[in-house]
Amino acid sequence: WSSKVLMSSANEDIKADLILTSTAPEHLSAPTLPLPEVQCFVFNIEYMNCTWNSSSEPQATNLTLHYRYKVSDNNTFQECSHYLFSKEITSGCQIQKEDIQLYQTFVVQLQDPQKPQRRAVQKLNLQNLVIPRAPENLTLSNLSESQLELRWKSRHIKERCLQYLVQYRSNRDRSWTELIVNHEPRFSLPSVDELKRYTFRVRSRYNPICGSSQQWSKWSQPVHWGSHTVEENPSLFALEA
């Protein structure tokens, strides 16, 4: 299956077309209260959460969420089958992986069942809203006396779809050194000082081949290499070159 399956419409901005509909003109004396914005994220292409701020409603209201894809076998809206709740009020919907189509426009409609004319529709490109799991199994190995290689694993999403951000620092550094690694879950540091203790961590995002997600995963668990002296407070070295 092609690595170029990517960017169907990944280069478009996420479109949030809020379409507020109302009843016939003679009933327009009371303005329609806007509905909260729906935010969707696809977690590791395993499930998707679409949430909204239920506390923005003036009265506790169980809003309903319906969704469909712009081009699909079944073009009718289907209602959420697994609502998320905040203080017993609907505040989101969890959608299982079988219902996730990354490369079709996702159309989501939030509605007030008490006032059916009060509804908002948004269109989202899900391939830009993927958040991977944090990388796992970070391992360090010596390529030579002074060269280190860091490797890691990502679960479920193919490596070529991911971009990684590697951060490392020694106990003598005030800040992290960071760099982007594309698709290959490995990074080598050409020169390390064996008298220093180094810390490494990695996070990933679904970008740029298969989507254009700007959201990074959580950081991996850190791994350490080098001198096992007590880690010193970097601020002590703030004046060093």
Epitope: W1, S3, V5, I157
Partner: nanobody
Amino acid sequence: QVQLQESGGGSVQAGGSLRLSCVASGDVYGRNSMAWFRQAPGKEREGVAVGYSVVTTTYYADSVKGRFTISEDNDKNTVYLEMNSLKPEDTAMYYCAADGNLWRGLRPSEYTYWGQGTQVTVSS
């Protein structure tokens, strides 16, 4: 549109191996699920294995689990079906299929695009 072309079929003794290839061309968005199916004479077409464009998940029919492996080579736009420990009951015409939706399963009705097929014959 997606075009699919299978190759690699042939005749083999029971216990032998074959590797089928499916070269895909055309619309890349039409290939988010890619599967292998087979059809023996007088029988319905059945799903064998399916893989997906962006995730590592694969699914296999119970009858081939542990013997068949679906894999990909993105640079060549090719999907493979590695078939080991072949049995006479694996004799069939093997088809490659593709669909634009992620998470298609092993039902023929879920797939939009089909190849012409390649014949596999396993003799005892």
